[in-house]
Interface confidence: medium
Amino acid sequence: RAVPGGSSPAWTQCQQLSQKLCTLAWSAHPLVGHMDLREEGDEETTNDVPHIQCGDGCDPQGLRDNSQFCLQRIHQGLIFYEKLLGSDIFTGEPSLLPDSPVGQLHASLLGLSQLLQPEGHHWETQQIPSLSPSQPWQRLLLRFKILRSLQAFVAVAARVFAHGAATLSP
């Protein structure tokens, strides 16, 4: 694992994987299908979705002082999105195209989250609702929204790892 004893991650490895995640998230987004907006949703940002915010220690100074706060936040987000991508939202009808990058995206989220998980240490992960089979139009709308949100999340994570690789690597 990349965080032996919970010290610092393999920044370069994390940077490479996070950049791959960015590419996959952008390539997956247009492929989730046409959205049938038969029912409007709430358009506010929900508190249940992990965001990387100012107080999370992901700024250059925060990463220098103690990168664990930021890495824990990123880890929570990766697990959150990994669960969503593995849920009925993406596995149910309408089926994704056989060559869809969503499968790769799911695997890469899991891979990066494992790189960040310290040996023998388990960060608390956010509970997400039990994602019971939703109607096809709901799945399409959710796929669109989840991937859009994931793009923003991995873009910030990639910047964090790029900074770490450039300035914090041993």
Epitope: E39, D42, L141
Partner: antibody, heavy 127, light 108 residues
């Protein structure tokens, strides 16, 4: 204890208005989609309206559309049903109920079962 | 709107009997089917959601099955407290969430 308590029912003349309230306790009200369901005397259950967790998405039965307005105040843990232009056929016991569905990314998902109900409040529309 | 038809509309049975109530949707509703029990003067109580999932706290003698258009609520061994009216409800197509007309279960 998870509880819903309706109030505001009563006798009203045709064409009149009433506002029903439903006070929630024992759970995080702001996370749940909520419903109103009614039952006319001696009749079955009729779904009336639904509101998403933040109040941003509402739905109505055709029979009340344009006359009833569902709303919520999450800071007060309270659900409302404003009923205008009341008709004799609106006479019923009105129940508020919590929806099993969850809102994620602004979309209500889940099965729409109602797992917690209030005791009901009676609305009588008569001249 | 999707119509829900329950049968029978009333039913007489004895304590210990196995009872089956059926619900048919006018079009496929996948597994979006819930069952409620209501006693006179009381609010409905959720028994089964998602066609076959037993709601927490509901006795295991209640079970649900079906998918698509045809659904069944079964009470394996009727108890005195089970005499009530039962409603099915679809939540596939909203609005509206439509209920069946109810099945009144009475003591024989």
């Amino acid at each position: 204890e998870v509880q819903l308590l309706e109030s505001g029912g009563g006798l009203v003349q045709p064409g009149g208005s009433l506002r029903l309230s439903c006070a929630a306790s024992g759970f995080t009200f702001s996370k749940y989609t909520m419903q109103w369901v009614r039952q006319a005397p001696g009749k079955g259950l009729e779904w009336v309206s639904r509101i998403s967790s933040s109040g941003g998405a509402t739905r109505y039965a055709d029979s009340v559309k344009g006359r009833f307005t569902i709303s919520r105040d999450n800071s007060k843990n309270t659900l409302y049903l404003q009923m205008n232009s009341l008709r004799a056929e609106d006479t019923a016991v009105y129940y508020c109920a919590r929806d099993l569905g969850q809102t994620i990314f602004g979309v209500v998902i889940g099965f729409g079962g109602m797992d917690v109900w209030g005791q009901g409040t009676t609305v009588t529309v008569s001249s | 709107d999707i119509q829900m038809t329950q049968s029978p509309s009333s039913l007489s049975a004895s304590v210990g009997d196995r009872v089956t109530i059926t619900c048919r949707a006018s079009q496929s509703i996948s597994s979006y089917l819930n069952w409620y029990q209501q006693k006179p003067g009381k609010a409905p109580k959720l028994l089964i959601y998602a066609a076959s999932s037993l709601q927490s706290g509901v006795p295991s003698r209640f079970s649900g099955s079906g998918s698509g258009t045809d659904f069944t609520l079964t009470i394996s061994s009727l108890q005195p407290e089970d005499f009530a009216t039962y409603y099915c409800q679809q939540s596939y197509s909203t609005p509206p969430y439509t209920f069946g007309q109810g099945t009144k279960l009475e003591i024989k």
